[in-house]
C-alpha cells in the first residue's frame, strides 16, 4: 500500500544556472494524498533557512504530482544561492532537499555602467 | 543614450484591435526587458505587461486575454496588440525599459507615450 | 493583486516646509519604487527600493518604510517639486501603482 506521507521530491544537490534578468520558476515537487500541505519556501544563509514571505508562489497541479513555484520575476544577482522548500502536514515538518541557483550577471560591472551613471544620462 | 519611442494609430474604433510599436536606441533588447504601461483618467498607471530578455512574456492577468506582447531583436523594436478595445481603454501607452541591480528591479526609461483614443 | 493606497490625494505645501506623504499597501512588498511625473511628461524614476534617489534628484528628497508602509519625505519643499508622486511595487503580478499624490505650492 502506498504511502500517504507528503514527500517533496527535491534531488540532493540538483543546482539551476540562470540568467539575472530573465524570469524563472522554481518548482519544489510535492506528492500528498487529500489535503494539500501548507508549503513555503526559505534561501540558506549559512546554517539558517530564512523564509522567503515577500514572494510571488504558485501551485500547479497535475494528475499525479503538483509543484509549489516559486516566481522571479525576474532574477536577480541576489538570488544566487540554495533554497529549500518546506511542508507542514498534521504536525509535522517536512523538508526537502537543497537545490542551488546559479546566477549569471549578463552585465558584469566591466561592460555595464552603475544605476547612478544610466540615470545621469537619463537627466542629461 | 537611451531611448524608447512609441507609435501608435491615434484613433482606434471600439471592438477593433490596437498595434503599437516601441523602437529603441541605445541597448539591446536581448539584455534589457522592455514593459508596456498605460496611463488613464479613470484607472491612472496600469502595468501591462512585459517582453524579457530571453524571449517569454509576463502579463498582468487583467487585461491578459486581450494582449500580446511581442518583438523583433535585430530591429530594436517591441510590440503591443490588443484586441476588442473599449471607449475605457483610452489613454496614453508608453513602452518602459525595466532594469536590475543586485538586489532589486525597475523601470528606468520611459518612451514620451502614445495617445490612443477609443471612439467611433 | 497587492493595492496601493496613496495620502493624501492632493497635498499643499509652501516653500520651506517639510512635506511627507504615504502608500500603504495591502500585503507586504519587498520594496516601493516612486516616480515623479508633472504635466504633459512622463514619469521619472525618483527613489529606487524604498530610500535609492535616483541621479539628479535633490538631497532633501528621501523615502522609507517597510512591509505595508513606505513614505516620500521632502525637508523643504521648493517650487520645482510641484507634481504628482506615485508609489510602484515590483513584488507581485500585476505589479501595480498607487492612484498619485498631487504635490502643489502654495
Known amino acids: 500500500k502506498e504511502s500517504c506521507d507528503v514527500q517533496l521530491y527535491i534531488k540532493r544537490q540538483s543546482e539551476h544556472s540562470i540568467l539575472a534578468g530573465d524570469p524563472f520558476e522554481l518548482e519544489c515537487p510535492v506528492k500528498y494524498c487529500a489535503n494539500r500541505p501548507h508549503v513555503t519556501w526559505c534561501k540558506l544563509n549559512g546554517t539558517t533557512c530564512v523564509k522567503l514571505e515577500d514572494r510571488q508562489t504558485s501551485w500547479k497541479e497535475e494528475k499525479n504530482i503538483s509543484f509549489f513555484i516559486l516566481h522571479f520575476e525576474p532574477v536577480l544577482p541576489n538570488d544566487n544561492g540554495s533554497y529549500r522548500c518546506s511542508a507542514n502536514f498534521q504536525s509535522n515538518l517536512i523538508e526537502s532537499h537543497s537545490t542551488t541557483l546559479r546566477v549569471t550577471d549578463v552585465k558584469s560591472a566591466s561592460e555595464r555602467p552603475s544605476k547612478d551613471e544610466m540615470a545621469s544620462r537619463f537627466w542629461a | 543614450q537611451v531611448q524608447l519611442k512609441e507609435s501608435g494609430p491615434g484613433l482606434v474604433a471600439p471592438s477593433q484591435s490596437l498595434s503599437i510599436t516601441c523602437t529603441v536606441s541605445?541597448?539591446?533588447?536581448?539584455?534589457?526587458?522592455v514593459h508596456w504601461v498605460r496611463q488613464s483618467p479613470g484607472k491612472g498607471l496600469e502595468w501591462l505587461g512585459v517582453?524579457?530578455?530571453?524571449?517569454?512574456?509576463s502579463y498582468n492577468p487583467a487585461p491578459m486575454s486581450r494582449l500580446s506582447i511581442s518583438k523583433d531583436n535585430s530591429k530594436s523594436q517591441v510590440f503591443l496588440k490588443m484586441n476588442s478595445l473599449q471607449t475605457d481603454d483610452t489613454a496614453m501607452y508608453y513602452c518602459?525599459?525595466?532594469?536590475?541591480?543586485?538586489?532589486?528591479?525597475?523601470?528606468?526609461?520611459w518612451g514620451q507615450g502614445t495617445s490612443v483614443t477609443v471612439s467611433s | 493583486q497587492i493595492v496601493l493606497s496613496q495620502s493624501p490625494a492632493i497635498l499643499s505645501a509652501s516653500p520651506g516646509e517639510k512635506v511627507t506623504m504615504t502608500c500603504r499597501a495591502s500585503?507586504?512588498?519587498?520594496?516601493m519604487h516612486w516616480y515623479q511625473q508633472k504635466p504633459g511628461s512622463s514619469p521619472k524614476p525618483w527613489i529606487y527600493?524604498?530610500?535609492n534617489l535616483a541621479s539628479g534628484v535633490p538631497a532633501r528628497f528621501s523615502g522609507s518604510g517597510s512591509g505595508t508602509s513606505y513614505s516620500l519625505t521632502i525637508s523643504r519643499m521648493e517650487a520645482e517639486d510641484a507634481a504628482t508622486y506615485y508609489c510602484?511595487?515590483?513584488?507581485?503580478?500585476?505589479?501595480?501603482f498607487g492612484g498619485g499624490t498631487k504635490l502643489e505650492i502654495k
Open positions: 541605445g541597448f539591446s533588447l536581448t539584455t534589457y526587458g
Open positions: 500585503s507586504s512588498v519587498s520594496y
Open positions: 518602459v525599459r525595466g532594469d536590475y541591480e543586485y538586489d532589486y528591479y525597475a523601470m528606468d526609461y
Open positions: 527600493a524604498t530610500s
Open positions: 510602484h511595487q515590483w513584488s507581485s503580478n500585476p505589479y501595480t
Open positions: 517582453m524579457w530578455p530571453g524571449g517569454r512574456t
